[in-house]
Interface confidence: medium
């Protein structure tokens, strides 16, 4: 399973960003991950 802070954040927020393959529905000015550090 994905265990980086990126994925933990995504699981807790119930969302993924395009960096990991799924786009969020609305813009939230919060850093949701580090898929490209």
């Amino acid at each position: 399973a994905c265990d980086t802070a990126t994925c933990v954040t995504h699981r807790l927020a119930g969302l993924l960003s395009r960096s990991g393959g799924v786009v969020k529905n609305n813009f939230v000015p919060t850093n949701v991950g580090s898929k490209a550090f």
């Epitope: 802070a5 990126t6 960096s19 990991g20 850093n31 949701v32």
Partner: antibody, heavy 122, light 107 residues
Framework: EVQLVESGGGLVQPGGSLRLSCAAS????????ISWVRQAPGKGLEWVAE??????????HYAEAVKGRFTISRDNAKNSLYLQMNSLRAEDTAVYYC?????????????WGQGTLVTVSS | EIVLTQSPATLSLSPGERATLSCKAS??????VSWYQQKPGQAPRLLIY???NRYLGIPARFSGSGSGTDFTLTISSLEPEDFAVYYC?????????FGQGTKLEIK
């Protein structure tokens, strides 16, 4: 203009210590996740450490090769990132890059500094 | 640790030709793969993130594809400025890791 400027590199003897700094400007530093990535002369890239944003409690992660020897930290008030390197070894010789990252969900921002050279030699 | 293996190590092509670079992961990394370009004396530059998303300002001739363990960076028609070293990276598991690089040189 976005800038990440590393400093603090130089020549140090094995077993010695060095503190690298990375000064950020042109973006909201506290929102960014920052990594140090290094590159030994003529070699490939190696991730060293990561510190998350202020809102993520500035959580840290390290590569096994540096765990217990290196400490990553940030001072958001000064828009600065640090890497305290102790018990340095010859294999730590590299150019050290500071890398800033922010994920908006619909797009990302990714900034690299130009690097600072650390040479560990007697 | 997830190992990324890039191939070929060196790719010799001419301007105008199509370049195909491969990156294979030792474990499944879904789409948590990025591609970087590095020229001598310069910092790496992000080209592709999330396996297939072009980064800001990156020309359309660069494209990425793949998921799971097999990933590809394609440069549709090489420009003189494209000759450089290319690295893939993964951020699916700690530690984040990079491939060993593919050197794209002028034939």
């Amino acid at each position: 203009e976005v800038q990440l400027v590393e400093s603090g590199g130089g020549l140090v003897q094995p077993g010695g210590s060095l503190r690298l700094s990375c000064a950020a400007s042109g973006f909201t530093f506290s929102n960014y996740w920052i990594s140090w990535v290094r590159q030994a002369p003529g070699k490939g890239l190696e991730w060293v450490a990561e510190i998350r944003s202020e809102s993520d409690a500035s959580a840290t992660h390290y590569a096994e090769a540096v765990k217990g020897r290196f400490t990553i930290s940030r001072d958001n008030a000064k828009n600065s990132l640090y890497l305290q390197m102790n018990s340095l070894r010859a294999e730590d010789t590299a150019v050290y890059y500071c890398v800033g990252y922010f994920d908006y969900g619909l797009a990302i921002q990714n900034y690299w500094g130009q690097g600072t050279l650390v040479t560990v030699s007697s | 640790e997830i190992v990324l293996t890039q191939s070929p190590a060196t790719l010799s092509l001419s301007p105008g030709e199509r370049a195909t670079l491969s990156c294979k992961a030792s474990k499944r990394v879904t789409t948590y793969v990025s591609w970087y370009q590095q020229k001598p004396g310069q910092a790496p530059r992000l080209l592709i993130y999330g396996a297939s998303n072009r980064y800001l300002g990156i020309p359309a001739r660069f494209s990425g594809s793949g998921s799971g363990t097999d990933f590809t960076l394609t440069i549709s028609s090489l420009e003189p400025e494209d000759f450089a070293v290319y690295y893939c990276s993964q951020s699916y598991n700690y530690p984040y890791t990079f491939g060993q690089g593919t050197k794209l040189e002028i034939k």
